[in-house]
Amino acid sequence: APVRSLNCTLRDSQQKSLVMSGPYELKALHLQGQDMEQQVVFSMSFVQGEESNDKIPVALGLKEKNLYLSCVLKDDKPTLQLESVDPKNYPKKKMEKRFVFNKIEINNKLEFESAQFPNWYISTSQAENMPVFLGGTKGGQDITDFTMQFVSS
């Protein structure tokens, strides 16, 4: 069966939107009005992995682009990147672990934990116009809570 996907945008708990920053990076900043069109639309695919009531494994692709968020070691540090894939083969139910995030819902907020690197989360900073990254702390000054807005196909 084909993998189930939905289109959505994400905003951090400070209401910053996610936009492209160069070809292989996302950044977070406050957008309003027509600028909202800049925000990236994700194709969130529900993939194979360890699942529970509040934890669902997903892959985060960029809609109509052959780019997926992935987690890899760079200079011995877990790092978030946008990785180019062959669109003929993706998305798929059994995604490589670096593409998988545990979508965790807590109090109507979402966290995205790397399946490859447990306790590392998709993060933004308090500052405006700075990259989205993989952070190793929750509840500190970095932001790990997001809300999801559904986008019609």
Partner: antibody, heavy 118, light 107 residues
Framework: EVQLLESGGGLVQPGGSLRLSCAAS????????MFWVRQAPGKGLEWVSV????????RYADSVKGRFTISRDNSKNTLYLQMNSLRAEDTAVYYC???????????WGQGTLVTVSS | DIQMTQSPSSVSASVGDRLTIICRAS??????LAWYQQTPGNAPKLLIH???SLQSGVPSRFSGSGSGTDFTLTINSLQPEDFATYYC?????????FGGGTKVEIK
């Protein structure tokens, strides 16, 4: 008053290492992104590296990637730049700078000179 | 990487002149542009951020304009202390990049 004071520069042979420090005062260091920017003698400005307040996010210019490492100790209000495998073209004044709104450098240190020569 | 091109690279002017420096980005950077002033032997000083916002403490004779790829720094009525080198810098994406600088000399 915001103050940034670099130290650790000097003369080093090609292939050698140096660690630069930047002592920050007059603001809540742990809340700010920080940059290293360099300027070769008689040349323009070149951005080198950035680090987030928590230290989890770092980025580097292609010219230093794999050789330089940015880090910080928020308990000591200090920013660092570990420079390995130094080359003659790394000769420059190295500035640390506090990152202001959206990615500008709103306060700069006075700079420390790194000379790579045999 | 985004290339930043400044013009002119140098200019001679007199006290009281109105001066315009142009900065062009190789791609759209929205309004994520800063301008700096550097005098010999000193660190750069932030003048303008977000293309048009005057940094606190900077005299109002300095102004910035533009968005997208084309930006200008204008100095109305040059003062003796304004003879320096000016740099633009894009903050749209990493790696951050600077223009090559514009040296403003006394005519």
């Amino acid at each position: 008053e915001v103050q940034l004071l670099e130290s650790g520069g000097g003369l080093v042979q090609p292939g050698g290492s140096l660690r630069l420090s930047c002592a920050a005062s007059g603001f809540t260091f742990s809340k700010y992104f920080m940059f290293w920017v360099r300027q070769a003698p008689g040349k323009g400005l070149e951005w080198v590296s950035v680090i987030s307040p928590s230290g989890w996010m770092t980025r580097y210019a292609d010219s230093v990637k794999g050789r330089f490492t940015i880090s910080r100790d928020n308990s000591k209000n200090t920013l660092y730049l570990q420079m390995n495998s130094l080359r003659a073209e790394d000769t420059a004044v190295y500035y640390c700078a506090r990152v202001g709104y959206g990615g500008n450098s709103d306060y700069w240190g006075q700079g420390t000179l790194v000379t790579v020569s045999s | 990487d985004i290339q930043m091109t400044q013009s002119p690279s140098s200019v001679s002017a007199s006290v009281g002149d109105r001066l315009t420096i142009i900065c062009r980005a190789s791609q759209d950077i929205n309004r994520w542009l800063a301008w700096y002033q550097q005098t010999p032997g000193n660190a750069p000083k932030l003048l303008i951020h977000s293309a048009t916002s005057l940094q606190s403490g900077v005299p109002s004779r300095f102004s910035g304009s533009g968005s997208g790829t084309d930006f200008t720094l204008t100095i109305n009525s040059l003062q003796p202390e304004d003879f320096a080198t000016y740099y633009c810098q894009q903050a749209d994406s990493f790696p951050l990049t600077f223009g090559g600088g514009t040296k403003v000399e006394i005519k």
